[in-house]
Every structure is written in C-alpha cells, then in structure tokens.
C-alpha cells in the first residue's frame, strides 16, 4: 500500500502528561523545639511544622518525626533554609576561654536515610563562619539541588546547634521537596 512506507515499524506509546498538582510535594516551616541530647559527632535533626501557617504536605508526601517521607521514585528538588542568630559576645568568649559549647561556625546538612543502607547520606551541606559579623548576628544558610530519590527514602535537616536556630518566623527557616 502506498503510504505504508511512512507507517512506523513499532507503535510508540506516550504516557499521558501528569499534572503538576498531582505530584508529591511539601513545604515545612520552623517550629519551636527544645535542644536534645545527641551524639558528639552527630548534628541534631530539626523538627518541622507540617500543617499550620505556610506549611503543607500533599499527594502522599508525608512528614513524621523529623523526616520527610518520599512516596515514589523520581527526581526531586530538595531545599532548605535555616536562619541562625546569636551574639558576638559568645564569640569573644570562645576566643578568650576556648569554650567548646558555643560554635564559631554554623552548619546545615540535608541528609537522606534509606532503610536498605546502614549509613545516612549527606546530600547537601552549608557552613558559614559567624564570629566576624556584627554584635547581634543573623545568618541564613540556603541549600537546594535536584536528586534522584527512591520510594521510602527519608529526608531530614541537621544543624550544628539547635539553640541558634531562629524560630521566630516561618519564612526564615524552612524545608521542602517536590517531584519534578
């Protein structure tokens, strides 16, 4: 038949485009928390607000006990901003007395935990020095990148010092992820 030459040799099946509104996503905001005991070489994980104010979880993306739970495999954009605050008087005390309990730097880590893998994986890390800034200092650290995640992966945000985290406004400290 004329025109048969133009027919494809195999049928290509196109998956219907998925609406963005159906994709798993979450935006979590800062919540007050009391500093807890943690192992010396491990940064404590932050708790998050998941339903009040600007915070939400949608389309099977769930938050439980510090962890954002990934409901399906795919490429996700993961982000967090943590705003720290303190006073430089703490820094001068560090220099004078060598006090180990007040840091001269602040660190944020976004960590992935996979049940099948024994060790948590650091996905993103940001560190800033704080001792050269003004008398009452504020320092935001923003992290964000795309990662391939598997269903069941868990994400958390660890910080070097919970007591320095600014919890006063939900737009200062936040954590989120969405399927691309």
């Amino acid at each position: 038949l004329k025109g048969q030459e133009f027919a494809p040799s195999h049928q290509q099946v196109y998956a219907p485009l998925r609406a963005d509104g159906d994709k798993p996503r979450a935006h979590l905001t800062v919540v007050r928390q009391t500093p807890t005991q943690h192992f010396k070489n491990q940064f404590p994980a932050l708790h998050w607000e998941h339903e009040l104010g600007l915070a939400f979880t949608k389309n099977r993306m769930n938050y439980t006990n510090k962890f954002l739970l990934i409901p399906e495999s795919g490429d996700y954009f993961i982000y967090s901003q943590v705003t720290f605050r303190g006073m430089t008087s703490e820094c001068s005390e560090i220099r004078q007395a060598g006090r180990p309990n007040k840091p001269d730097s602040i660190t944020v880590v976004i960590t992935k935990v996979t049940d099948s893998y024994p060790e948590p994986t650091q996905l993103l890390m940001g560190t800033k020095s704080v001792c050269e800034v003004g008398s009452n200092w504020f320092q935001p650290i923003y992290l964000g990148a795309m990662f391939s995640l598997q269903e069941g992966d868990k994400l958390m945000v660890n910080v070097s010092d919970i007591s320095l985290v600014d919890y006063t406004k939900e737009d200062k400290t936040f954590f989120g992820a969405f399927l691309l």
């Epitope: 919540v31 007050r32 009391t34 708790h47 607000e49 339903e51 009040l52 104010g53």
Partner: antibody, heavy 124, light 107 residues
Framework: QVQLVQSGAEVKKPGASVKVSCKVS????????VHWVRQAPGQGLEWMGV???????DYNSKFQGRVTMTRDTSTNTVYMELSSLRSEDTAVYYC??????????????????WGQGTLVTVSS | DIQMTQSPSSVSASVGDRVTITCRAS??????LAWYQQKPGKSPKLLIY???SLQDGVPSRFSGSGSGTDYTLTISSLQPEDFATYFC?????????FGQGTKLEIK
C-alpha cells in the same frame, strides 16, 4: 504582625447568651488554631475550647452543650458563643493563637499570642 | 483531665531576690509545660515552653526546669517589672489545664 482584637465588654442577664468576636490579622484562621480561655475575677485561667484550622472544634467538657465556636473566613474572625449564662460565667474571655513546640519527639501546645480580653458580666 | 497545682499561691520578695515557683502535674506531662506572666488588666505573656526553653524576647533572668510531674520557674534577680501573677500550663492534652497562679508581690 500577629494581632487578635476582641469585641467590647458585655453585660448580660442570667439565662441569656453572649457572643464574643476575635478578629485576627497577620495570619489566617484557616491556617492556625484559635483557642478560647477565660478568667473569672481574681481567679486562674480556664481553657474553654478551640477552633482548629480545619474548622472542626473541641470543647472543654465543662462547657459542652453551652459553648459554640464558629468562624467567618471572609473577615478572618472567630466567634465564641456561651449560652444559659449564670453569675459564675462573669469573667474576662480571651482568644489566643496556639503554637506547637517539640520536646524530643512529642509535640505540645501553648499560647504565644493573645487577644486583649473581653469582660462579660452576668448580673440580674 | 490533668490537674496542675502551683505553689505557693503568693510570695513576697524584694528587687534583686531569687524567687522560685513550682508546678506539679497530676500525671507525667513529659516536659510539655509552659509558664506565663500576667499583669493586672493585661493578657498573659508566654515566658517559657517545653519546661526550660525561653520564649523569644524574654529576659534571661527567667529560667525553667523540671521533668515528669514536677516543674519550677526561677527568676534569678527580681526586677520591678517582674511583680505579677505567674501561671503554668500543660500542653500535652486537652483541656490544656493551667495552674491556679502564683502572685508575686513586693515585700
């Protein structure tokens, strides 16, 4: 900034009802929980109930059947109505926005933001 | 319901004094305790949450401690503006009971 502004003082007769309003700004009543707490003259604070962000309510069993909490999302206002008033209901009534906080892995509620209070006097 | 018992009901002290107020819960509230300050004719003000964490903007002379059923609020060096009534409140479960209050008066 967060503000809760309550309606003015009321004088009511026993058996009547009173409806106190709490107009909020700086947040939405659909995204935060608003509680009601009362304080009789010279007495302590007594939790009455909550209008949850999702529009459901919980009431202190002491007031169950007499208290009704509602809201108007168009004006960002929460209302507390108390019926069958008696002299013991004479008190200052406060609305308050609840805050969540964590200790270890458990969360708890407290009240970082309060309205200015509304004095309700029940007298024959 | 959880019952909250504060003591003393009133205390007289002078500027510069150290004052301690206690609050006992009828069951373990796992450090889910807040402290408030209230001045006459004013709304309560949150001072401490989680038994020991200072709310933003509250002076460091205020501190809280305790666990289980027993909690304390301490003012290390009383200032004139600290004379007020103090309440504890459990945040674990409804009806989120308050203590009956401790009135701090000038000696």
């Amino acid at each position: 900034q967060v503000q809760l502004v309550q309606s003015g003082a009321e004088v009511k007769k026993p058996g009547a009802s009173v409806k106190v309003s709490c107009k909020v700004s700086g947040f939405s009543v659909t995204r935060y929980n608003v509680h009601w707490v009362r304080q009789a003259p010279g007495q302590g604070l007594e939790w009455m109930g909550v209008m949850w962000s999702g529009a459901n309510t919980d009431y202190n069993s002491k007031f169950q059947g007499r208290v009704t909490m509602t809201r108007d999302t168009s004006t960002n206002t929460v209302y507390m109505e108390l019926s069958s008033l008696r002299s013991e209901d004479t008190a200052v009534y406060y609305c308050a926005r609840a805050g969540r906080y964590y200790v270890d892995s458990n969360y708890y509620w407290d009240f970082p933001y309060w309205g200015q209070g509304t004095l309700v006097t029940v007298s024959s | 319901d959880i019952q909250m018992t504060q003591s003393p009901s009133s205390v007289s002290a002078s500027v510069g004094d150290r004052v301690t107020i206690t609050c006992r819960a009828s069951e373990d509230i796992y450090s889910g305790l807040a402290w408030y300050q209230q001045k006459p004719g004013k709304s309560p003000k949150l001072l401490i949450y989680g038994a020991s964490s200072l709310q933003d903007g509250v002076p460091s002379r205020f501190s809280g401690s305790g666990s289980g059923t027993d909690y304390t609020l301490t003012i290390s060096s009383l200032q004139p503006e600290d004379f007020a009534t103090y309440f504890c409140q459990e945040g674990l479960k409804s009806p989120y009971t308050f203590g009956q209050g401790t009135k701090l008066e000038i000696k």
